[in-house]
Interface confidence: low
């Protein structure tokens, strides 16, 4: 049909930097390049009806989804959404074409769904409708990646099932200790599947996608190192496979490794071994055990032996269910005001944890170091001397783990005064919680040193906010000193602050500070 | 299938009243929907429309006669036409989610 208008859909994605939510404006924002959302022909329908290709958004991103008619004359429309019906005001590019544009600031759920735009030009009415979903995240998983031997080939295969397909690396390293940590110059990306260099210091395999990064260490015992003081300790859940590497080298190729379980041989198929000269002339072994799917009765110890080494041992537990062990009881903290502390968390866990810290509703990355002991630690040092309630959170697939912290600075109390026509009160959040006195001042006490005992009202409280506590004391007014200025103090082993109130009749009341150290 | 069925119109003097129905089948919710108009040679317009806070939108026109209300157990969005004029006559339609109804022909008469 000739008489029907050109008319082009397109998103806009933008990067974020508004909170607002759905306007229907040409709204300025940073944008990426328009994607063109196609806007077909609707067939077999009653009306002339323009289907866009339906738009997957990120929650909280931005977005505008805009239609440019080719049309003569001037346009009006209506853009309607659930409830919502909203006037829209078209405006014309520098090719004449009616631009319609609707804003969506920071997707929700409740942005969501079917966006009908009503369009009436000179010569026709006609519908625009736009599916607007949130992209399905739900359904993403990120599994941390496992192992397995490559058919008929000495190479390693990393599998990790998660959705989106993760792109999957290697990351290698030949030195030993901090010198492999992640940015080091030490350390080899390789962006594929299979490794066959299996020879090296330290090999992990890494996963990533939408979701994030996940890395599995293939579990390493070198005879060449000294043993660590307590024995390594490997965990895995039933039917997860287990794969240690024995390494070795020696002068000559004149040695040969075995792996036992708990003193006996294993049997063939759960084992493999490669060997290589090094630059130097000396042979390389390594002995790989492995087990496609353990059962309980692979737990026990693992121990790789040589003709020419001392032979070593790793501990191999098979749980049913992952876990979390660390003390949970809180823990309370008092430093000075300058001192450097760290909250820390000592934790054995399997799978590897993700966690938190979190202080005033406000949440901070959480790094995690693996100890020789097989224990893991988190330290949290940014609390930038806030006094209040600190809280570690961790979770794996199977076990959720909290602890509270309490911290608490030990300062001058800083006094604060407020007054009403029957009392007034002072506040202070000094640690350690200061005691109060109120005085009277007065001709025959113009020091103010009369000292008011009757009337007076102490109480602490949670500032729930920050989890601080706050010391309060109210004075309740009598006709004695109506009038009068009072002074409460507050000290503490560090110090003393006052605030001197003049109790006037009902009004606004002045307030000195007074501090004294 | 979408399906959107318009009944109520008629024949009406000049002054009187209609009450028009829109049933929707095969359609989730009628909260999308909109009653628009067209007149012998003209353009179809917007008649009314449900707001952002629940409330609801008319032409200007039509202010304080005419309004809108859904029956969502029944699936159906109804037009009550108060004060009925002359240039009022024209064929109403519902449409919601890119379908448009066949439409039902008021005629108001002086």
């Known amino acids: 049909n000739q008489d029907l208008p050109v008319i082009k859909c397109v998103l806009i994605n933008h990067k974020n930097n508004d909170s607002s939510v759905g306007k229907s404006s040409s709204y300025p924002m940073v944008s990426e390049s328009p994607e063109d959302l196609g806007c077909a022909l609707r067939p077999q329908s009653s009306g002339t009806v323009y289907e866009a290709a339906a738009v997957e958004v990120d929650v909280s991103a931005s977005i505008t989804l805009q239609v440019l008619v080719d049309a003569p004359g001037n346009i009006s429309c209506l853009w309607v959404f659930k409830h919502s019906s909203l006037n829209c005001q078209p405006h014309f590019d520098l090719q004449n074409r009616g631009v319609v544009s609707m804003v969506i600031l920071k997707m929700t759920e409740t942005q969501a769904g079917e966006y009908l735009l009503f369009i009436q030009s000179e010569a026709t009415n006609y519908t625009i409708l736009f599916t607007v979903s949130i992209r399905n995240t739900l359904l993403y998983t990120l599994r941390r990646p496992y192992f397995r031997k490559m058919e008929n080939q000495d190479a390693l295969v990393c599998i990790s099932e998660s959705v989106p397909e993760p792109i999957v690396e290697w990351v290698l390293c030949d030195s030993q200790g901090e010198s492999c940590k992640e940015e080091s110059p030490a350390v080899v990306k390789k962006e594929e599947k299979v490794l066959h260099e299996l020879f090296g210091t330290d090999i992990r395999c890494c996963a990533r996608n939408e979701l994030g990064r996940e890395c599995t260490r293939l579990f390493t015992i070198d005879l060449n190192q000294t043993p660590q003081t307590t024995l390594p300790q490997l965990f895995l859940k039933v039917g997860e496979p287990l794969w240690i590497r024995c390494k070795a080298v020696h002068v000559n190729h004149g040695f040969g490794l075995t792996w036992e379980l708990e003193n006996k041989a294993l049997e063939e198929g759960n084992y493999f071994e490669m060997s290589t000269y090094s630059t130097n002339r000396t042979m390389i072994r390594i002995l790989f055990a492995f087990v496609s799917s353990v059962a309980r009765n692979d737990t026990g110890y693992y121990t790789c032996s040589s003709s020419k080494h001392p032979s070593q041992s790793a501990l191999v537990t098979i749980v049913e269910k992952g876990f979390i062990n660390a003390t949970n009881s809180s823990e309370d903290y008092e430093i000075d005001q300058y001192e450097e502390f760290c909250f820390s968390v000592r934790f054995k866990a399997y799978p590897q944890i993700r966690c938190t810290w979190t202080f005033s509703r406000k949440s901070f990355p959480c790094e995690q170091k693996g100890l020789d002991n097989g224990y893991s630690i988190s330290k949290f040092c940014n609390h930038k001397h806030q006094p209040g309630e600190y809280i570690f959170h961790a979770e794996n697939d199977d076990a959720q783990f909290t602890k509270m912290f309490t911290l608490n600075i030990r300062r001058k109390p800083q006094v604060l005064a407020e007054a009403s026509a029957s009392q007034a009160s002072c506040f202070s959040d000094g640690y350690p919680l200061p005691s109060w006195t109120w005085k009277k001042c007065s001709d025959k006490s113009p020091n103010c040193t009369e000292e008011i005992t009757e009337g007076v009202w102490n109480r602490k409280a949670n500032r729930k906010v920050f989890g601080q506590w706050v010391s309060s004391s109210t004075l309740n007014m009598s006709e004695a000193i109506k009038g009068f200025l009072v002074k409460c103090c507050a000290y503490n082993s560090l110090g003393t602050s006052c605030e001197t109130i003049l109790l006037n009749s009902p009004g606004p009341f002045p307030f000195i500070q007074d501090n004294i150290s | 299938q979408v399906q959107l069925q318009e009944s109520g119109g008629g024949l009406v003097q000049a002054g009187g009243s209609l009450r028009l129905s829109c049933a929707a089948s095969?359609?989730?919710?009628?909260?999308?929907m909109v009653w628009c108009r067209q007149a012998p040679g003209k353009q179809r317009e917007l008649v009314a429309a449900?707001?952002?806070?629940?409330?609801?939108l008319y032409a200007d026109s039509l202010k304080g006669r005419f309004s809108i209300s859904q029956d969502n157990a029944k699936n159906t969005v109804l037009l009550l036409m108060n004060s009925l004029k002359p240039e009022d006559t024209a064929v109403y339609y519902c449409?919601?989610?890119?379908?448009w109804g066949r439409g039902t022909k008021v005629t108001v008469s002086s």
């Open positions: 449409c919601g989610l890119g379908h």
């Open positions: 095969g359609i989730f919710s009628t909260n999308y």
């Open positions: 449900f707001t952002n806070d629940g409330g609801t």
